[in-house]
């Protein structure tokens, strides 16, 4: 049994890091493998992650972590029984994938303005709370070409757009994702999408 693709890990910079790797053949990850991880810190304790299958030869492990900060560095040991298959390290702050924003809501009761709001996925005491920027994706269910991205570079988790920038009388969906420049993160996953029917009063044309 050998590791074909070494584990790569990303952290949500809060409580979970996810590591993925591939074996050289079909593997029952949860029964055959264990990923041991330990913070390189005084008094830290070793933890064991039981991996799950991620495709025939792929494995994924969700590592639980406390009080993640930029100084943290973890040792990782991948075991198959008594055999050490791979040894490495992981610094969560250097591989951050933020949590996805939640509670995306479209408020259509403001006069001819769409207000989209969502929740910051981090608590106020987490460093990322004040450092997330967002991308909002809006698309038409009827017209695949009607697909747009709005970059939200301010801290407030909201976006206002004129309803008239979208077509009237059809349904739209929206979703939002986040990233943080300070840690050069990857983008988060998209939030679950929300749907609304876009309708607004066309202004009378003057002749």
């Amino acid at each position: 049994m050998k590791v074909l693709q070494e584990p790569t890990c990303v952290s949500d910079y809060m409580s979970i890091s996810t590591c993925e790797w591939k074996m050289n053949g079909p593997t029952n990850c949860s029964t055959e493998l264990r990923l041991l991880y330990q913070l390189v810190f005084l008094l830290s304790e070793a933890h064991t992650c039981i991996p799950e299958n991620n495709g025939g030869a792929g494995c994924v492990c969700h590592l639980l972590m406390d009080d993640v900060v930029s100084a943290d560095n973890y040792t990782l040991d991948l075991w198959a029984g008594q055999q050490l298959l791979w040894k490495g390290s992981f610094k969560p702050s250097e591989h951050v994938k933020p949590r996805a924003p939640g509670n995306l809501t479209v408020h259509t009761n403001v006069s001819d303005t769409l207000l989209l709001t969502w929740s910051n996925p981090y608590p106020p005491d987490n460093y990322l709370y004040n450092h997330l920027t967002y991308a909002v994706n809006i698309w038409s269910e009827n017209d695949p070409a009607d697909f747009r991205i709005y970059n939200v570079t301010y801290l407030e988790p909201s976006l206002r757009i004129a309803a008239s920038t979208l077509k009237s009388g059809i349904s739209y969906r929206a979703r939002v994702r986040a990233w943080a420049q300070c840690y050069n993160t990857t983008w988060s996953e998209w939030s679950p999408s929300t749907k609304w029917h876009n309708s607004y009063r066309e202004p009378f044309e003057q002749h």
Partner: antibody, heavy 116, light 111 residues
């Protein structure tokens, strides 16, 4: 919000021991290390030691080895610092402070006076 | 005694800028991150800067931190009378056993 509530002031005689408590609330108690830091009157901050509340393991500053004991009670989310063989130089305010590499939150402090 | 050295005192007028230095060595500041604490008279210390230059939620951006080599600096702009306090740097040292040294402390007087 995070709160670290410390026990009240103590007056002790030289040679005696003192046990200071620090009750934590507003966060997951076992997820954060706890430090103890003291400050003698008019002096600076002095680190004494650290405890991992999850397993109870400890590490102490060399200066206090053999005299200090840190413990925790997870059922009450409380950490304790006991200092023995007290001398007058141990008169200080003793603080508990939550954190790993740095101290996010501090208790208000417990004044321990050692006097004959 | 502390292995991190700070000036005993600094002073400046309201609205001015002040910097406080913290000098250490390769086994502490040179190999770790620096934090700064503010201690107002008669109160417990409060975390002001961590990770060399990050501010906890609620700390105004008048406070800034930087690190270069084995030294660190705390900067305070737009001084206010309420900033009058003792300031301590802190880090951790892994040269022999893990320890958390603090700086000698700096008394800031707002004139």
């Amino acid at each position: 919000q995070v709160q670290l509530v410390q026990s009240g002031a103590e007056v002790k005689k030289p040679g005696a021991s003192v046990k200071v408590s620090c009750k934590a609330s507003g966060y997951a108690f076992t997820s954060y290390y706890m430090h103890w830091v003291r400050q003698a009157p008019g002096q600076g901050l002095e680190w004494m030691g650290i405890i991992n509340p999850r397993g109870g393991s400890t590490s102490y500053a060399q200066k206090f080895q053999g005299r200090v004991t840190m413990t925790r009670d997870t059922s009450t989310s409380t950490v304790y610092m006991e200092l023995s063989s007290l001398r007058s130089e141990d008169t200080a305010v003793y603080y508990c402070a939550r954190g790993k590499y740095w101290m996010y939150d501090w208790g208000k402090g417990t004044l321990v006076t050692v006097s004959s | 005694q502390s292995v991190l050295t700070q000036p005993p005192s600094v002073s400046a007028a309201p609205g001015q800028k002040v910097t406080i230095s913290c000098s250490g060595g390769s086994s502490n500041i040179g190999n770790s991150y620096v934090s700064w604490y503010q201690q107002l008279p008669g109160t417990a210390p409060k975390l002001l800067i961590y990770d060399n230059n990050k501010r906890p939620s609620g700390i105004p951006d008048r406070f800034s931190g930087s690190k270069s080599g084995t030294s660190a600096t705390l900067g305070i702009t737009g001084l206010q009378t309420g900033d009058e306090a003792d300031y301590y740097c802190g880090t951790w040292d892994t040269s022999t056993v893990w320890e958390w040294p603090f700086g000698t402390g700096t008394k800031l007087t707002v004139l």
